[in-house]
């Protein structure tokens, strides 16, 4: 029963991680511009995500512009989008597989098969976590590298936004949840040990006693 509890905990953590990956992908705060600029007097903050860039003004008004043309997007941004989306889709599959394989559900009756299905779900969650971790870490690395790169001007230097932190948290939850699901080892098959049955015949005093029969040797032709 403790194993079922661990399974459920793993599933909940991985599910929360999957939700986090969706939130991270949707958030427009992946990169925050640390230098607003001389001519943008009203701007408080400028930030961009995978799908749009936004300007938050001192009035409280937020104006966002969706990246409309795929052709104008850098290959890095397109790859980041792709990995995040594939990670989310993989998470969907993992959720369905886990639901089928968990001990607390009755979709499959065979315990060995259920355990194997849960392990598959765990592996899928681990892969989903990696697919989230790679683009998030790559984006963070680019931001840090640019920050110290003297060629990148002040106006283009960026800071890490909430989207990246949510992405890391999501990946961590999926990794943890996936690992817990992978710990669902198939139940060991019961081994029936053959009990030795010793048959002892009534003792006979004659020389034939060693044969375990009630006959004397002389009775054999």
């Amino acid at each position: 029963m403790a194993n079922a509890g661990l399974q459920l905990l793993g599933f909940i953590l991985a599910f929360l991680g999957w939700i986090g990956a969706i939130v991270s992908t949707a958030l427009p705060q992946w990169r925050i511009y640390s230098y607003a600029g001389d001519n943008i007097v009203t701007a408080q903050a400028m930030y961009e995500g995978l799908w749009m860039s936004c300007v938050s003004q001192s009035t409280g008004q937020i104006q966002c512009k969706v990246f409309d043309s795929l052709l104008n997007l850098s290959s890095t941004l397109q790859a980041t989008r792709a990995l995040m989306v594939v990670g989310i889709l993989l998470g969907v599959i993992a959720i369905f597989v886990a639901t089928v394989g968990m001990k607390c559900t009755n979709c499959v009756q065979d315990d060995t098969a259920k355990a194997k299905i849960t392990i598959v779900a765990g592996v899928l969650f681990l892969l989903a976590a990696l697919l989230t971790l790679v683009p998030v870490s790559w984006s963070a690395n680019t931001i840090i590298r640019d920050f110290y790169n003297p060629v990148v001007p002040e106006a283009q230097k960026r800071e890490m936004g909430a989207g990246l932190y949510v992405g890391w948290a999501a990946a961590a939850l999926q990794l943890l949840g996936g690992a817990l699901l992978c710990c669902s080892c198939p139940p060991r098959e019961k081994k029936y040990t053959a009990t030795k049955v010793v048959y002892s015949a009534p003792r006979s005093t004659g020389p034939g006693a060693s044969l375990g029969t009630g006959y004397d040797r002389k009775d054999y032709v």
Partner: antibody, heavy 118, light 108 residues
């Protein structure tokens, strides 16, 4: 007044070394990335190297990698360019320039002439 | 061989409008800011335009900058004799600063 003043140029033999200096005044030197740009006689502008405000990070044009070294001393408000293994084609006016917020060279020095000849 | 391509020369008569082009790539002009410089004979270059279209302090309104895709241009309207100089465009990519070869503007 915002000003950059280069010094250290002159005549040097091929294979020789030279160290250029650039004294900054009128602005917070430690807040800006600084750069060296050169101009050969009758030719266009050519970027040489750049250094970030703290001096921790530098970048050089590919052709100067290994021969030229940019450095700065923020306590002295001075930028340096150490040039080694000089060649005849390094003959040029070397300008020190401030790298502005938008990736433009907003302040330039008057330049110092470096002549590499035997 | 310069990374950014500029016409070697341009000319115009006083009062005329002249445009100088600067062609680059996605990694420099296409993605980053463009600056324009004026270099009068025997002097250091002077910044005219930064952030692609913003005029530097003291630069007359006759000068304007624009960008489209991987190309940028500097327009000078109401040309004057004192505008006769060399003009350079400049941008950067991830690791290097790049200049155009320069355009010699002659006021006829």
């Amino acid at each position: 007044e915002v000003q950059l003043l280069e010094s250290g140029g002159g005549l040097v033999q091929p294979g020789g070394s030279l160290r250029l200096s650039c004294a900054a005044s009128g602005f917070t030197f430690s807040s800006y990335a600084m750069s060296w740009v050169r101009q050969a006689p009758g030719k266009g502008l050519e970027w040489v190297s750049i250094i970030n405000p703290s001096g921790a990070s530098t970048s050089h044009a590919q052709r100067f990698q290994g021969r030229f070294t940019i450095s700065r001393d923020n306590s002295k408000n001075t930028l340096y360019l150490q040039m080694n293994s000089l060649r005849a084609e390094d003959t040029a006016v070397y300008y020190c320039a401030r790298y502005g917020r938008y990736g433009s060279f907003d302040i330039w020095g008057q330049g110092t002439l470096v002549t590499v000849s035997s | 061989q310069s990374v950014l391509t500029q016409p070697p020369s341009a000319s115009g008569t006083p009062g005329q409008r002249v445009t100088i082009s600067c062609s680059g790539s996605t990694s420099n002009i296409g993605r980053n800011y463009v600056s324009w410089y004026q270099q009068l004979p025997g002097t250091a270059p002077k910044l005219l335009i930064y952030d692609t279209s913003n005029k530097h302090f003291g630069v007359p309104d006759r000068f304007s900058g624009s960008k489209s895709g991987t190309s940028a241009s500097l327009a000078i309207s109401g040309l004057r004799s004192e505008d006769e100089a060399d003009y350079y465009c400049q941008s950067y990519d991830s690791s290097k600063v790049v200049f155009g070869g320069g355009t010699k503007l002659t006021v006829l």
